[in-house]
Interface confidence: low
């Protein structure tokens, strides 16, 4: 008789997960000139260590603390690109403009980049078949605390101009719930951050409107400047030649708004 | 176009100096890691230092650690490799080469350096 | 640090295909490079990450890496395709970088 398991909502933890965690960590460390003393093997057993035999809906921030010391890393503070909603033109730009980095150009943000994972209470096992989802099931999951844990130290390390690109075609660019809008915003250290550059980046060819007086932005706006931390927008009009034009910025078409 | 050229080869005599400059063009210097890379006659590749992007971290062969110091200049665009107490197995011709990722997509020409008395 | 161990020398008829092998401990785990070099001239990038091949170089390289071993292949060997042979990965607990020792490919 097969042993009665708890079924989630969500998707359950990725194939290979263990091995995918490990061989993203040793590219990672190959990479990174300055993560090249990491053990990998020591980061995928503190990163097991967080879930493994655990109640996957009563995880805690403090449950990733070994794995947050191995995975220390210093980005350059003053050129951290935050996102929300708009992760794979935040990535394209990073990998262009490679002096900026958002929280999936670091070790642990590469390391867990669109997986899922989840264990069981008591058991050393990994649950492939269903993992707790944010809404259905409960925001203290595995994955949820991970990423919470790790925006909020990316955040609180950001200084002088830290920018964020926002997607103006959803219908709330700015999401207090979303991760940015949740956690990264009031992590932000006003001692340390002079301001914050808000990038909308349009989705239509034709869409010529400012998005940055959208409701949202408003709101944004009025988070951010209570916080004591200055705020400015940009419309980014066209994305694809806001790329090609950070490849090649001596282009004479890249003088013009984009 | 994308260009390496190393200079500052010739001969020296054993613990003697010399200092090796690779000027880069045609792309933004300090956005990339760059390596100096030798090869003795008729011999295979040996990498001898690595220096960050920034400036800030800096690897080198056991066989030179302590003789050899890698450095830049962003605002020149240039690489250097500072040689001191040469021996006559440093005989090699020196290529400096850009890193992109973990491979080098861009190498100079090379420049001959000879020790001997 | 890994030692990459090449043959050094390989030879092919013109049209067939050759085949480089790069052997180390665990190298599947690492990511190799290969670097085609001829006489009196600096060494060109062939493949990187594994199998990855640089704009302008021919379809016919192609790369893998598996278990020990990671392999260059040239497909429909070319008179031209006459040059040294080098791996190249990374020992990321020193920091250094390690070439293998180089294979003299020889088109008959």
């Known amino acids: 008789v097969p042993r009665w398991r708890q079924q989630w909502s969500g998707p359950g933890t990725t194939k290979r997960f263990p091995e995918t965690v490990l061989a993203r960590c040793v590219k990672y460390t190959e990479i990174h000139p300055e993560m090249r003393h990491v053990d990998c093997q020591s980061v995928w057993d503190a990163f097991k260590g967080a879930f493994i035999s655990k109640h996957p809906c009563n995880i805690t921030e403090e449950d990733y603390q070994p794995l947050m010391k191995l995975g220390t890393q210093t980005v350059p503070c003053n050129k951290i690109l935050l996102w929300s909603r708009i992760k794979d033109l935040a990535h394209q730009f990073t990998q262009v403009q490679r002096d900026m980095f958002t929280l999936e150009d670091t070790l642990l943000g590469y390391l867990a980049d669109d997986l899922t994972w989840c264990g069981e209470f008591n058991t050393s096992k990994i649950n492939y078949q269903s993992c707790p989802d944010w809404r259905k099931d409960c925001s203290n999951n595995p994955v949820s605390v991970f990423w919470k844990t790790v925006s909020r130290r990316f955040a609180e390390a950001a200084c002088d101009v830290v920018h964020v690109m926002l997607n103006g075609s959803r219908s709330k660019i700015f999401d207090k719930n979303s991760t940015f809008g949740s956690v990264e915003v009031h992590n932000l250290q006003p001692e340390k951050v002079q301001t914050l550059e808000a990038w909308v980046i349009h989705g239509g060819r034709e869409d010529s409107r400012d998005l940055c007086q959208d409701p949202t932005i408003k709101e944004l706006e009025s988070i951010i400047s209570k916080r004591n931390i200055q705020f400015s927008c940009k419309n980014i009009y066209r994305p694809d030649k806001f790329l090609q034009c950070v490849k090649n910025p001596e282009d004479s078409s890249c003088t013009s708004e984009i | 176009q994308v260009q390496l050229v190393e200079s500052g080869g010739g001969l020296v005599q054993p613990g003697g100096s010399l200092r090796l400059s690779c000027a880069a063009s045609g792309f933004t210097f300090s956005n990339y890691s760059m390596n100096w890379v030798r090869q003795a006659p008729g011999k295979g590749l040996e990498w001898v230092s690595y220096i960050y992007g920034g400036g800030s971290y800096t690897y080198y062969a056991d066989s030179v650690k302590g003789r050899f110091t890698i450095s830049r200049d962003n605002s020149k665009n240039t690489l250097y490799l500072q040689m001191n107490s040469l021996r006559a197995e440093d005989t090699a011709v020196y290529y400096c080469?850009?890193?992109?990722?973990?491979?080098?997509?861009?190498w100079g020409q090379g420049t001959l350096v000879t020790v001997s008395s | 640090d890994i030692e990459l161990t090449q043959p050094p020398s390989v030879s092919v008829a013109p049209g067939q295909t050759a085949r480089i092998s790069c052997s180390g401990d665990?190298?599947?785990?690492?990511?190799v490079s290969w670097y085609q070099q001829k006489p009196g001239q600096a060494p060109v990038l062939v493949i990187y990450?594994?199998?990855k091949r640089p704009s302008g170089i021919p379809e016919r390289f192609s790369g893998s890496n598996s278990g020990n071993t990671a392999t260059l292949t040239i497909s429909g060997t070319q008179a031209e395709d006459e040059a040294d042979y080098y791996c190249q990965s990374y020992t990321f607990e020193s920091g250094s970088v390690v070439f293998g020792g180089g294979t003299k490919l020889t088109v008959l």
């Open positions: 665990n190298l599947g785990s690492k990511v």
């Open positions: 990450y594994d199998n």
């Open positions: 080469a850009r890193q992109a990722g973990m491979y080098f997509d861009v």
